[in-house]
């Protein structure tokens, strides 16, 4: 399956925080989305192979890495001034 952690996270102002996303499905593609209250999902970043990733619609203030197939961590940087949201990780073949 696919595992995202932590379930809840509080960020101190000026800090970077990292959200973990791990999958054991042998999927090549992984995605990070953000959902604000009353809105749909918006794509932050996506990765289609190991060690490559592309910006989605709202990449500013976020960074990612794809050092291995199973993992696609998302860092919410201090530059992201409005980080409060629901974050969703997904994967696909």
């Amino acid at each position: 399956g696919i595992t995202q952690s932590p379930k809840y996270l509080f960020r101190k102002e000026g800090q970077n925080v990292t959200l973990s996303c791990e999958q054991n499905l042998n999927h090549d593609a992984m995605y990070w989305y953000r959902q604000d209250p009353g809105q749909g999902l918006r794509l932050i970043y996506y990765s289609q192979i190991v060690n490559d990733f592309q910006k989605g619609d709202i990449a500013e203030g976020y960074s990612v890495s794809r050092e291995k197939k199973e993992s696609f961590p998302l860092t919410v940087t201090s530059a992201q001034k409005n980080p409060t949201a629901f974050y969703l990780c997904a994967s696909s073949i």
Epitope: I49, V50, N51, R66, K68
Partner: antibody, heavy 120, light 112 residues
């Protein structure tokens, strides 16, 4: 910053096995990426030999596959190349190399290279 | 295997010149992901190659803006807009879309 350093004998006799080791510092080879061997015969172009992945899986150049083994020693953070039944055509500078973050499989971090001569 | 053919094999130019090197692949380099993994390296005698351009047109960090890459499918170019003395070297294109990864035969850029 990832740093790579090749080591091994500079002279190998024909029909014997060439063995080289790459020591990696600044990053754990089990944490991610692909750890490559590339060679360059004197005065010629570059040839990709193969890689070992962070999970220990391999990918080899089919032209060399029957003679090549790339393995690793995770306790020493090293990966190694063995090329059997060498001939003079295997004389080359051998590089170990790994990718830069976010560039796909393109390699950026290189060792300094080690010249291996095949001669009796 | 994907054959990578560079032209010219050698080139004489002067400081300040605009130079274009071409690279043609025997098959399309568009990956199933939609990305094109065509890269350019610079190599000086006795040194390991230096990474210049990745994924066709992205300059690697620290690479001067006079270096640019373009192209698609099977045809690619590396352009140096105004040659500097330190640019005289051998240039290689490389593809990592298909295994085995392959390199062009090189283009040697010499001082005229």
């Amino acid at each position: 910053q990832v740093q790579l350093q090749e080591s091994g004998p500079g002279l190998v006799k024909p029909s014997e096995t060439l063995s080289l080791t790459c020591t990696v510092s600044g990053y754990s080879i089990t944490s991610g990426y692909f750890w490559n061997w590339i060679r360059q015969p004197p005065g010629k172009g570059l040839e990709w030999i193969g890689y070992i992945s962070y999970d220990g899986s391999n990918n080899y150049n089919p032209s060399l596959k029957s003679r090549v083994t790339i393995s690793r020693d995770t306790s020493k953070n090293q990966f190694s190349l063995k090329l059997s039944s060498v001939t003079a055509a295997d004389t080359a500078v051998y590089y170990c190399a790994s990718p830069s973050p976010g560039t796909g499989y393109a390699v950026d971090y290189w060792g300094q290279g080690t010249l291996v001569t095949v001669s009796s | 295997d994907i054959q990578m053919t560079q032209s010219p094999s050698s080139l004489s130019a002067s400081v300040g010149d605009r130079v274009t090197i071409t690279c043609r692949s025997s098959q399309s380099l568009v990956h199933s992901s939609g990305n094109t993994y065509l890269h350019w390296y610079q190599q000086k005698p006795g040194k390991a190659p230096k990474f210049l351009i990745y994924k066709v047109s992205n300059r690697f960090s620290g690479v001067p803006s006079r270096f640019s890459g373009s192209g698609s499918g099977t045809d690619f170019t590396l352009t140096i807009s105004s040659l500097q003395p330190e640019d005289f070297a051998t240039y290689y294109c490389s593809q990592s879309t298909h295994v085995p990864f392959t390199f062009g035969q090189g283009t040697k850029l010499e001082i005229k």
